[in-house]
């Protein structure tokens, strides 16, 4: 096989030009040796038509050139004013004879079509660039070149080679020639706008000998992609505007009749109607980005457009992409509370719906942050460690098969106010947004723990009590030990349950938990809470510190505690130990496949690992009257 390479077949029409590029291996000898173009005869002989030594045959006189580009290891044969007689077999080659290294090229020149004023149609989108090709004959090589736009009978000059540019094309139109071509000039018109559409005429020379080409430019509005989404679900707009706007600010806007109102842009602008439920994520260095909107509402339906401009606002003549979003009101996603209210020091239980068909999917809860383009770092998940700053006060309770999971956050502060997202690694449509509003508390919390300064001594018995009001009388009370992978229910004893509901004494409604004997691993956060079946209610938290018995102090086992222990049978202790390997955060990459902005909180996995045995459940029993 020949190491020379080029086009095997070249086809054109009479009067046109061709530029045939031949590629050769990059060696010093090849760069400097003779290059040739010859025509293959019937007798097997290849007659030289042009060579790099300066030879030019009579039939090519005035219409052909051969140029070597040693830096690119190529040479180019330009042949103008083609006739049908130019049809034939040729070779482009290297060497002192025409038998050296060569490549066979077939050239076919057809008759000009019936319509000599063949109009070339250019179809471009708004904001893009068109390159209009204008061919001319050798005789007009040094003549003035121009492009004009037909307006009725007149043709108004857009640009010409004397550097004139029509004001409406200023900074958008350039006229240039390219490479070695001596029979073609180009006009680029960038940032196309609808009014640019129409018939253009490019011209080289003046009067009857002028060469003219017609070009019909069609400027298209982007065809909107149709998106059908359910109410309360989410939508992702994937925007790919091309490399030419990679460094410009990006935006997503919603079209009205006349304008397009920016919903979000990379300069920090965000429509308040989308607060807490929108994220903009750059995808790569080529200008691709995506916008995710959750908790779709009926009023979100409409025409959306993404674009790029340094201002971060829609600008005529800049590339755009369009969608039409339809929001189906017959949604499979259940209606859940969009606003949850809490008070400082109190707690909230947030119910997160998920696709019931995906009960084994991993569940997550993230905090939407407004900074930059919005992000949502994961705070807790079924296999994600609780984020730093939330230890002891945040837990996720999965209720397999119920189509919902509950997230409990206690020890609330006003800083907890904001937007939170429920999401899973399954059906991405099931993303719900909750706004948490935390107000200053004006009264004592419903649940109170005593003693409030909870320090237990190793080897001794330690009882902790949770006081609840009569309104929680009929609800199930529980104590649980908080660990990084949830809050594990512990055996406890409800003293209030022994009293009749008629004579509820506010002061004596107590649920107690006893650690007997106290072990070092009992140290940690404990929660007291109420629930009805799968519905979780108020919780309160207390940190129990565990210390060694000080030398010399007697081991006192309070008699009343012993008496209570005899009265109340010990309940079966619940296993609350945690296997080490289960406690690592392994977020499924599918969860974030199309939303990298939802940050993985599992990065602290190594430093936050819970100890192998999170609680000495065996020593915990209820013994309260």
């Amino acid at each position: 096989q020949s190491p020379i390479f080029g086009p095997q077949d070249v086809s054109s029409i009479e009067g046109n030009s061709v530029s045939i590029t031949c590629y050769y291996p990059d060696t010093s000898v090849n760069r400097h040796t003779r290059k040739y173009w010859c025509r293959q005869g019937a007798n097997g002989y290849c007659a030289t038509l042009i060579s790099s030594n300066g030879y030019l045959s009579k039939e090519y006189s005035g219409r052909a050139s051969l140029i070597n580009f040693p830096e690119n290891s190529t040479f180019v044969i330009n042949i103008a004013h083609l006739t049908q007689e130019d049809t034939g077999s040729y070779k482009c080659g290297l060497g002192t004879t025409n038998r050296g290294l060569f490549f066979d090229v077939s050239l076919e020149v057809s008759q000009v079509p019936e319509f000599p004023n063949d109009t070339h149609v250019y179809t471009k989108d708004i904001g893009r660039t068109v390159t209009i090709e204008c061919r001319f004959k050798e005789g007009n090589a040094h003549s003035k070149k121009s492009l004009c736009k037909k307006r009725g009978e007149a043709c108004e000059v857009v640009i010409d080679s004397t550097e004139y540019v029509d004001p409406s094309y200023k900074d958008r139109a350039i006229l240039f020639m390219k490479g070695t071509s001596r029979d073609i000039f180009y006009v680029n018109i960038s940032h196309l706008i609808p009014s640019d559409a129409g018939l253009y005429v490019c011209q080289a020379g003046e009067g009857p000998s002028a060469d003219k080409n017609n070009a019909d430019l069609q400027v298209l509005e982007p065809e909107p992609e149709l998106l059908y989404k359910d109410l309360r679900s989410s939508v992702t707009f994937e925007c790919d505007l091309g490399r030419e706007v990679a460094n410009d600010a990006k935006y997503l806007c919603r079209k009205n009749k006349e304008t397009c109102d920016v919903i979000i842009n990379t300069l920090g602008k965000r429509d308040p109607a989308f607060e807490g439920r929108i994220l903009l994520t750059p995808r790569d260095d080529n200008g691709r980005f995506s916008v995710l909107i959750t908790g779709l509402r009926k009023e979100d339906a409409g025409h959306y457009q993404c674009g790029a401009h340094s201002s971060g606002l829609p600008q005529e003549g800049w590339p755009v992409q369009a969608w039409q979003l339809f929001v189906n009101e017959e949604s499979t996603i259940p209606n859940s509370r969009s606003v949850v209210k809490g008070v400082t020091g109190g707690s909230v239980a947030i119910v997160c719906p998920y696709n019931p068909k995906e009960s084994s999917s991993l569940k997550y809860w993230c905090h939407w942050e407004a900074d930059e383009n919005g992000r949502c770092p994961v705070l807790v998940g079924t296999q994600a460690l609780v984020q730093e700053g939330y230890e002891g006060r945040l837990a996720l309770f999965d209720q397999p098969g119920s189509g919902a999971y509950t997230v409990i956050l206690n020890q609330l502060t006003t800083q907890d106010s904001g937007f939170y997202w429920c999401l899973t690694d399954g059906d991405s449509r099931w993303r719900t947004t909750i706004e948490l509003q935390v107000a200053e508390a004006t009264k004592k919390p419903d649940l109170e723990v005593t003693p409030q300064n909870a320090t237990a001594v190793i080897g001794e018995t330690f009882t902790i009590s949770c006081h609840y009001p009569c309104k929680f009388y009929s609800q199930e009370k529980y104590w649980c030990k908080w660990s990084n992978d949830g809050c594990h229910i512990l055996p406890s004893h409800d003293e209030g349950a022994r009293q009749s509901s008629v004579s509820c004494d506010q002061s004596s409604q107590i649920v107690s938990m006893t650690l007997n004997p106290v072990k070092k691993e009992d140290e940690g956060w404990y929660w007291c809470g109420v629930k009805e079946g799968q519905v979780y209610g108020e919780t309160t938290a207390i940190y129990v510190a565990v210390e060694e018995r000080t030398r010399g102090s007697p081991h006192i086992n309070p008699t009343d505690a012993n008496a209570r222990a005899k009265d109340a049978p010990e309940e079966e202790a619940m296993e609350s130990s945690v296997r080490e390997d289960e406690n690592k955060a392994n977020l499924d990459p599918r969860l974030f496949a199309d939303e990298r902005e939802i940050q993985n909180a599992g990065d602290q996995a190594q430093e936050n690992r819970a100890s192998g045995n999170a609680g000495s459940a065996g020593g915990q029993s209820g013994s309260s009257k």
Partner: nanobody
Framework: QVQLVESGGGLVQTGGSLRLSCAAS????????MGWFRQAPGKEREFVAA??????????YVGDSVQGRFTISRDAAGNTVYLQMNSVKPEDTAVYYC?????????????????????WGKGTLVTVSS
Amino acid sequence: QVQLVESGGGLVQTGGSLRLSCAASGRTFSPYAMGWFRQAPGKEREFVAAIRWSGATTYKYVGDSVQGRFTISRDAAGNTVYLQMNSVKPEDTAVYYCAADRVPKDISIDPRNPKDWDYWGKGTLVTVSS
């Protein structure tokens, strides 16, 4: 979004023929050049054929290993390119990828270099059985 969709791949016997098609679609995508590359398992992507056009002039390029057996052509609109594969051999077994260029490149750019093509299809598998 520019999309190149290949079709026509499949199982063919040695000596047989196959015609691959590649349709360029997207927001009024009008390519300037389209081509075919192939990649056999464990091998580098190899140039097969390309077609480039400028006005009424068309240039067709064919790779050494398929010279005389494979031909490339396009439809009148210029948005679909075809690869006619004749006298196929077992060594033609590969995933065939379509490539396209939207903007005229510098005249010296070699169509055989995959890096110089802007858009790619997902590929279609051609298996030649002996």
